[in-house]
Each structure stands twice: as structure tokens, then as C-alpha cells.
Interface confidence: medium
């Protein structure tokens, strides 16, 4: 009696199941009690000897490529051996690599967590994912895993993380890069500093006083509000960041506390108060302002 090994499918793709069947065309396995064993190269597979002429392999991988055969043994201990069958496991090259961010859109608050998710639409086996920062490509990290997605995490985003990123996937057929993704790090404003600028050391009534408010950190645009005591004098915008100024024509009523507030939609911060006093110097006829 002759024995044949049949693999179904005969050209499996990585990750897919394969059924090995030990066939005896001129002998019904019911005619005699047979035990079956399947081999790859020199190693027995699965449970070893079994009464089933089939062996189900849940997932085949590239390294499972090899020469397979089966043996059948009767109760009388006669062993039949099939001819070897070469099974080549097919690897699908990676294709359509994309990079996505969490949070979506690539906008993240300073100090928050950023995840760069690299995905492939196609590809089997061990896929190496690599993440790069900047168009020049500083290699951040690599991961090799049997999945179509992998993640690179920045637990606490800093201002210096604002850059373009891309990822590359590779499973042996050459690297496939994703497109560039821009990351914007949104920074809440720091506490602003209020400075008073007068045309001379001792400003007089009717002089123009410049109130300059500046938050040293914070994502633009920044809106600045100016206050005398708790009365709003007005607002100024700094579309590209930096500070903003508000001009005031001085009168005697302008003595008191001044402050400013910076707001960029990620939180507001108020400056320390600056006090202005009108003084009358000895022998002088006009009022002067000191801060």
C-alpha cells in the first residue's frame, strides 16, 4: 500500500491554517487499525502518533517552510512512509503604511501622552516597525512583532517634540515608509510679566504710558487683557506669540494698580500687579508719576 501526504492549501500564506492529510488510496483506513504520525524535516509534529489521518496546523509561518511527510503504522507494527512534500509558506510584503496619532490630528498639550500608531494594510510574518523624527530621520525606536500595527509612545510631550514624524515597516522585502505627520505641541501660557514704559524717567500728566504684557511661554495666538484696578482697559492680540502693548494717555486718575492677563485658549494667567503713584516733587509745579 502506498501513502501520500496532502497539504491543503499547498501554498499557504503566513498566518493561515494548513491541514495535513495522510492518504492511502488503495486501502481504507477502516480496514485496519492505523496510527498516524506527521513529520517536518526530522521532527514529529503535533501529538505524535494518533488515530487521526489529519493534522490541523493553526497558523503557518515562513520558518515552517520545509519538507513534510507522514507515516502510518498498523497494529502489526508495519510502518508505511509517504514521500516528502515541500511546503513553502508565502510571506506577503508590507504595503500601504500609514502613521496616525492619538490624540487624532497631531495636536497635543504639553505634558500629555502622544502615541504614534504605525499600520500596514498588508503584510505577514514578523514585521519590523521603525519610527523616525524629522524629515532627515532620527531613529526613535523599532519594534518587531506579528501584527499589522505597532505603537510608539511619548508619555509626556515636550515643546521639542513638535516635529514631523514618519514610520517605516519592513518584513524582508524592503522598507515601506509612511507619509509625514506633523505634531503640534500646544503649550498653555506662562504667567505674564507687565512692564510700564514711559517717554521719560518721571512721566507727567498727558504723557503716553505704554503697558507691555508678555507671556514668555505659550502657543500662539495669545490674547492679552489690560486692567487698571479691576477695570478692563482693553485687549490686544499676539497672533504669532510674543507680547502686546496697550497705550494710555496719563491723567491724575491713572494712579493705582495695573495688571494684565494672557489667554491662548489653553488657560489664562494673570500678571503680578504694578502700582503707579503720582507724586509732587519739591519745588515742582506739575504732577509726576512713579511706579
Amino acid at each position: 500500500a502506498e501513502l501520500f501526504l496532502i497539504a491543503s492549501p499547498s501554498h499557504p500564506t503566513e498566518g493561515s491554517p494548513v491541514t495535513l492529510t495522510c492518504k492511502m488510496p488503495f486501502l481504507q483506513s477502516s480496514d485496519a487499525q492505523f496510527q498516524f504520525c506527521f513529520f517536518r524535516d526530522t521532527r514529529a509534529l503535533g501529538p505524535g502518533w494518533s488515530s487521526s489521518p489529519k493534522l490541523q496546523i493553526a497558523a503557518m509561518w515562513k520558518e515552517d517552510t520545509g519538507s513534510y511527510w507522514c507515516e502510518a503504522q498498523t497494529m502489526a507494527s508495519k510502518v508505511l512512509r509517504s514521500r516528502r512534500s515541500q511546503i513553502n509558506v508565502h510571506r506577503v510584503p508590507v504595503a500601504d503604511v500609514s502613521l496616525e496619532t492619538q490624540p487624532p490630528g497631531g495636536q497635543v498639550m504639553e505634558g500629555d501622552r502622544l502615541v504614534l500608531i504605525c499600520s500596514v494594510a498588508m503584510g505577514t510574518g514578523d514585521i519590523t516597525f521603525l519610527w523616525y523624527k524629522g524629515a532627515v530621520g532620527l531613529n526613535l525606536q523599532s519594534k518587531t512583532q506579528r501584527s499589522l500595527t505597532a505603537e510608539y509612545e511619548i508619555p509626556s510631550v515636550r515643546e521639542s517634540d513638535a516635529e514631523q514624524y514618519y514610520c517605516v515597516a519592513e518584513n524582508g522585502y524592503g522598507p515601506s515608509p509612511s507619509g509625514l505627520v506633523s505634531i503640534t505641541v500646544r503649550i498653555p501660557v506662562s504667567r505674564p510679566i507687565l512692564m510700564l514704559r514711559a517717554p521719560r524717567a518721571q512721566a507727567a500728566v498727558e504723557d503716553v504710558l505704554e503697558l507691555h504684557c508678555e507671556a514668555l511661554r505659550g502657543s500662539p495666538p495669545i490674547l492679552y487683557w489690560f486692567y487698571h484696578e479691576d477695570i478692563t482697559l482693553g485687549s490686544r492680540s499676539a497672533p504669532s506669540g510674543g507680547g502686546a502693548s496697550f497705550n494710555l494717555s496719563l491723567t491724575e486718575e491713572h494712579s493705582g494698580n495695573y495688571s494684565c492677563e494672557a489667554n491662548n485658549g489653553l488657560g489664562a494667567q494673570r500678571s503680578e500687579a504694578v502700582t503707579l503713584n503720582f507724586t509732587v516733587p519739591t519745588g515742582a509745579r506739575s504732577n509726576h508719576l512713579t511706579s
Epitope: 504595503a95 519592513e170 524592503g174
Partner: antibody, heavy 117, light 112 residues
Framework: QVQLVQSGAELVKPGASVKVSCKAS????????MHWVKQAPGQGLEWIGR????????KYNEKFKSKATLTVDKSTSTAYMELSSLRSEDTAVYYC??????????WGQGTLVTVSS | DIVMTQSPDSLAVSLGERATMNCKSS????????????LAWYQQKPGQSPKLLIY???TRESGVPDRFSGSGSGTDFTLTISSLQAEDVAIYYC????????FGQGTKVEIK
């Protein structure tokens, strides 16, 4: 431009070992797997094995498993192949080659290893 | 291993004429999952390294003249040089990369 520059020809005695180098430039070394191919005098091409420069993981043709050892030095973008227990039948030109789109798109100039007493 | 067999072993063609060579694999190199044939063609001139001409059986490598074309699917493949030039004198190898790479024995192209 992409270049793979191999070390010079070697004349070695039977039983000795030799280490062939392949310096890559013009591309990101860790992104492309490096393969090695043998060509005996007047013969065809024979695949030896490959290495992933990123992880250092390698795979070999069964025939060369006890003959060749593949390594990389990421800091210098250099791949190495060490051939051991050399015999006359190991006399050949050895090529390093980069793989892209499955195929070997760039090749080194080849290193002739001559085994003779 | 997948065995690659090339024919003919050598080929003499007049300048400007068509040169055709074949490559047969012991197993199919076409996979339904991505409809790709895992086959490449290389040119090797005397004293030089091999040069990639064609990959995925029919995709021409950049910089390769369009007189070179690859065709075929499954187990039978063809490399055609539509109009042979003097600089095309070389040995041409096919290679499969469905499994660990194996090469054909080569076809030598000469001028008649």
C-alpha cells in the same frame, strides 16, 4: 547615492577563517536587510543568508549554516560575513547585496576569497 | 528548495534583433493574496557585479532601458530584449524570492 563597498581580495590557507566586510552608504543602513551571495569561478549565483541590520537577526541557507556567520556594526553601517574552516571549494567571489521590493537592488563590487595552501 | 531552470544556456542574437530567454520554477511564484509573482531578473557582465533589471516578474528597475521587459506568471517567465545592443552581452539570471532566494543557472547572451 547608494554604495556598498566590500573589503579587498583575500588569500587564505585551508582550515583558516576570513571576515569580509561590506560598508554601506547613501541610505539608512538599518532599514534594508543585507543578503550575501556566493559565486564560484565560472559558476552561477548561490544565496548564503541574510541579516536584518536593525535587530541583528539572521537566516541562512542550510548549506552555509556551519560555514558563514553574519553580523553588523550599526555605528559604522557595516555588514560582515565570517567564513570558517575554509576549503578549496570555498574559493569564490562573495557579494553583499541590499534587498528592496523583494529583489536585490544594489550589490557590492564583490570580494574574491582564494583558499590555497 | 524551489528550483529555477533557465533556457537556453546560451543565446546568439544579431544586433538590433530580439533576444528571448525563459525561466521555469519548480513551484508557482504567483500568490493570490497580493497577485504578485515573486521573481526577479539580473544582468551580469564579465568581471562585474550582478545588476537588477526586473522585479515582481514585470516591473522594470529605474534606470533600466525599456528594451528590457519581463513577463509570465506562476511557473513560467520570460525576459525579452526587444533590440539587442552590444552592451547587452552578459549572463542573465532569474531569481525567486517566494522562499529563501534561489537563482537559475543563467543564460549567456552573445552577438551573432
Amino acid at each position: 547615492q547608494v554604495q556598498l563597498v566590500q573589503s579587498g581580495a583575500e588569500l587564505v590557507k585551508p582550515g583558516a577563517s576570513v571576515k569580509v566586510s561590506c560598508k554601506a552608504s547613501g541610505y539608512t543602513f538599518t532599514r534594508y536587510w543585507m543578503h550575501w551571495v556566493k559565486q564560484a569561478p565560472g559558476q552561477g549565483l548561490e544565496w548564503i543568508g541574510r541579516i536584518d541590520p536593525n535587530s541583528g537577526g539572521s537566516k541562512y541557507n542550510e548549506k552555509f549554516k556551519s560555514k558563514a556567520t553574519l553580523t553588523v556594526d550599526k555605528s559604522t553601517s557595516t555588514a560582515y560575513m565570517e567564513l570558517s574552516s575554509l576549503r578549496s571549494e570555498d574559493t569564490a567571489v562573495y557579494y553583499c547585496t541590499r534587498v528592496n521590493s523583494g529583489a536585490m537592488d544594489y550589490w557590492g563590487q564583490g570580494t574574491l576569497v582564494t583558499v590555497s595552501s | 528548495d524551489i528550483v529555477m531552470t533557465q533556457s537556453p544556456d546560451s543565446l546568439a542574437v544579431s544586433l538590433g534583433e530580439r533576444a528571448t530567454m525563459n525561466c521555469k520554477s519548480s513551484q508557482s511564484l504567483l500568490y493570490s493574496s497580493n497577485q504578485k509573482n515573486y521573481l526577479a531578473w539580473y544582468q551580469q557582465k564579465p568581471g562585474q557585479s550582478p545588476k537588477l533589471l526586473i522585479y515582481w516578474a514585470s516591473t522594470r528597475e529605474s534606470g533600466v532601458p525599456d528594451r528590457f521587459s519581463g513577463s509570465g506568471s506562476g511557473t513560467d517567465f520570460t525576459l525579452t530584449i526587444s533590440s539587442l545592443q552590444a552592451e547587452d552581452v552578459a549572463i542573465y539570471y532569474c531569481q525567486q524570492y517566494s522562499n529563501y532566494p534561489t537563482f537559475g543557472q543563467g543564460t549567456k547572451v552573445e552577438i551573432k
